[in-house]
């Protein structure tokens, strides 16, 4: 079932988007689920449709509920429940859990703060924030298009930070809140000397004529967030993009972040319709980083057919 | 290596260093130096064509390495020489790594004395 749960507080816009995702151009029809009774989609209600939009200016704790999309395409409908709780402002400072978005977890490199679902609402900068209902301040916070930036994090800048802004639709103002926590993670990143996991130094690929084959370069370049580390292929000391053999590509494979907290990238190279040529290049897998590079190299071999049994 | 001598402060230098016996498929070429007494550090490193290069941090912005493929040489342009870059200077090269880290390199020449004097 295609449900997702959305919440605001009375008099504040709350502006919901349909579950089911579907083309600009598809037709989408709301409803209240209750009463099966469509949501108007003039501008001058309180509670109106936009497409994929529902919107609450503002809302009211009797506006919570449960809401049904229907996107209508000319092939096929799809259907989606948006559950809607307005909750009542509260007196003092506690943001009750069941209005926090999910938490984000910085560290000292890393320490951007997303205002939650300001990309639903049309809304103009600055931002305003608030860490435990106190206006931020100072050179250290730095709110920056969406998010908010802290420099120089520190264990006590975890906490529930609030962003306030303002929805505009057509000439009238709403105000819109969003909180969330935020908690920093005591991790030492370092930064080491390229390491390849894959593939081995020399290694012959064994690979059939006129078939597909895919070779994986893999490295890993330390610990949590790396500056200016990558993996790429080369042809005969040449990048992939120079070399101009269209049937032979690179694509970045997964970001990954192993159980031990290295962090590592993947680059597939996928050659096409292998031919002979081919079998005479260099292939050479470079991991380079802040530290410096390190290569592999590749060759590949002509894998025999293998013999049938008759 | 060739290209060392003895320079006044803020003058320039040009070492150049001559691999032989590679092709086409990559070399990492890097400049080390080693003050009397003091342990040696890397300078300034370049892979094959030019597109990778690493400088130390003392080095950067006065020091330039740069690479001619087809001679297989690789050029340490030195300016605005300090009295501290006195060091006898080691070309290194490698097939499969390149950095700062001398450890790294399987192939060195003979060195090239640089001496600035204030």
């Known amino acids: 079932k295609f449900s997702k749960q959305s919440w605001g507080l009375e008099n504040e816009a709350l502006i919901v988007r349909c579950p089911r995702q579907g083309k600009p151009s598809y037709t989408v029809d709301w409803y209240y689920s209750q009463t099966n009774k469509s949501i108007p989609t003039q501008e001058r209600n309180r509670v109106f449709a936009s497409g994929q939009l529902l919107k609450f200016l503002p809302a009211a704790v009797a506006d919570s509920g449960i809401y049904t999309c229907i996107v209508r395409s000319p092939t096929f409908n799809r259907t989606g429940y948006a559950n809607v709780t307005i909750y009542k402002k509260q007196s003092d400072c506690n943001v009750p859990d069941y209005l926090m978005y999910s938490t984000v977890s910085g560290s000292e490199k890393n320490s951007k703060i997303y205002c939650p679902t300001i990309d639903l609402y049309n809304w103009t900068a600055p931002l305003e924030w608030f860490k435990n209902c106190q206006a931020l301040q100072g050179s250290r916070y730095r709110a920056h298009k969406s998010f908010l930036v802290i420099d120089n994090v520190m264990t006590e800048d975890a906490g529930d930070y609030t962003c306030k802004f303002i929805h505009n639709e057509n000439g009238a103002n709403y105000s819109v809140t969003a909180t969330r926590s935020f908690t920093v993670k005591d991790e030492q990143g370092f930064s080491l000397f390229p390491v390849i996991g894959a593939p081995a130094q020399n290694e012959i690929k064994e690979v059939e004529i006129g078939k597909n084959a895919n070779l994986t370069c893999s490295a890993c370049f330390g610990k949590g967030t790396q500056f200016l580390a990558a993996v790429l292929w080369q042809l005969n000391g040449t990048k992939i993009t120079d070399f101009g053999e269209p049937r032979i590509q690179q694509e970045e494979g997964q970001n990954q972040s192993f159980s031990n907290g290295l962090a590592c990238l993947d680059m597939v190279l996928r050659i096409a319709d292998v031919k002979e040529e081919d079998l005479l290049l260099q292939y050479d897998c470079l991991a380079l980083n802040l530290h410096g590079l390190r290569r592999h190299t590749v060759r590949l071999s002509r894998k025999n057919p293998s013999k049938e049994c008759f | 290596e060739s290209g060392g001598g003895s320079v006044q402060a803020g003058g320039s230098l040009r070492l150049s260093c001559a691999a032989s016996g590679y092709t086409y498929s990559g070399i990492c070429m890097g400049w080390f130096r080693q003050a009397p007494g003091k342990e040696r550090e890397g300078v300034a490193a370049i892979y094959t064509n030019g597109e990778y290069t690493y400088y130390a941090d003392s080095v950067k912005g006065r020091f330039t390495i740069s690479q001619d493929n087809a001679k297989n040489t690789v050029y340490l342009q030195m300016n605005s020489l300090k009295p501290e870059d006195t060091a006898m200077y080691y070309c290194?090269?490698?097939?499969?790594?390149?950095?700062?880290?001398?450890?790294?390199?399987?192939?060195w020449g003979q060195g090239t004395q640089v001496t600035v004097s204030s």
């Open positions: 290194a090269a490698d097939r499969n790594t390149c950095g700062l880290r001398g450890d790294f390199y399987n192939y």
